[in-house]
Interface confidence: low
């Protein structure tokens, strides 16, 4: 029975030309979290094996950092990084929990950074 | 108990330089994963540069081709050397890592102050 549940940084906003923290967090199971995938759309971004630890698809490999934790870091924000995002948590014994992200890329300075880090 | 301890700042003029230290203790692991942080005065926290345990690193553009990243992992420490160091690089400098093998959770350090003035 899959009792977890995915809080992530929601719907959030960023300038054209910033970075921007993506970041999920799984709670409320005792899975092992075996695998995370970072996805946008339908292209791989990166993932984190709790294993092999991090690979970041070429593609975004001048762009995309990994970190904090399971969260991923994106820089030199273009509007075309406009969209969903998806964290996917591979668990055992639960299966895949998914958490949804989507994020808009604006032109100017009015962009309101819904997922800013705070110091802990 | 898990803890990270930055040292290394202080008052430099500009473009001088500075290393960073993060020591993590208390660790029954060795991070896979190690960051800096920074946060100015009236600014948000933002990231500076991550390291890998394989040795992949990332930077923040602002800082690419002045700070290096690395880090050791025998005595699971990373540093950060700063150089041609601005005014604009003044801030609290956060060392963060994972605190388990799922690496769920973050770990931040205390801080520690770079001041970049004449």
């Known amino acids: 029975m899959m009792t977890g549940t995915i809080e992530t940084t929601g719907n959030i906003s960023a300038e054209k030309g910033g970075s921007i923290i993506l970041q999920c967090h799984l709670s409320s199971t005792t899975a092992q979290v075996t695998q995370v995938n970072w996805e946008q759309q339908d292209q791989l971004l990166a993932i984190c094996n709790a294993d092999l630890g991090w690979h970041i698809s070429p593609s975004f490999k001048d762009r995309v950092a990994p970190g904090p934790g399971l969260g991923l870091t994106l820089q030199s924000l273009t509007v075309n990084d406009t969209g969903e995002y998806f964290c996917i948590y591979h668990t055992y014994p639960d299966g895949t929990y998914t958490g949804r992200i989507f994020l808009e890329v604006l032109e100017s300075s009015v962009a309101e950074h819904g997922a800013r880090f705070q110091i802990p | 108990e898990v803890q990270l301890v930055e040292s290394g700042g202080g008052l430099v003029q500009p473009g001088g330089s500075l290393r960073l230290s993060c020591a993590a203790s208390?660790?029954?692991?060795?991070?896979?994963?190690m960051g800096w942080f920074r946060q100015a005065p009236g600014k948000e926290r933002e990231w500076v540069a991550s390291?890998?345990?394989?040795?992949?690193?990332w930077y923040a553009d602002s800082v690419k081709g002045r700070f290096t990243i690395s880090a050791d992992n025998s005595k699971n420490t990373a540093y950060l050397q700063m150089n041609s160091l601005k005014p604009e690089d003044t801030a609290v400098y956060y060392c963060?890592?994972?605190?388990?093998?799922?690496?769920?959770?973050?770990?931040w350090g205390q801080g520690t102050l770079v001041t970049v003035s004449s």
């Open positions: 963060a890592t994972d605190r388990g093998p799922a690496m769920v959770f973050n770990l």
């Open positions: 208390g660790f029954t692991f060795s991070p896979s994963w």
């Open positions: 390291v890998l345990r394989g040795g992949y690193t």
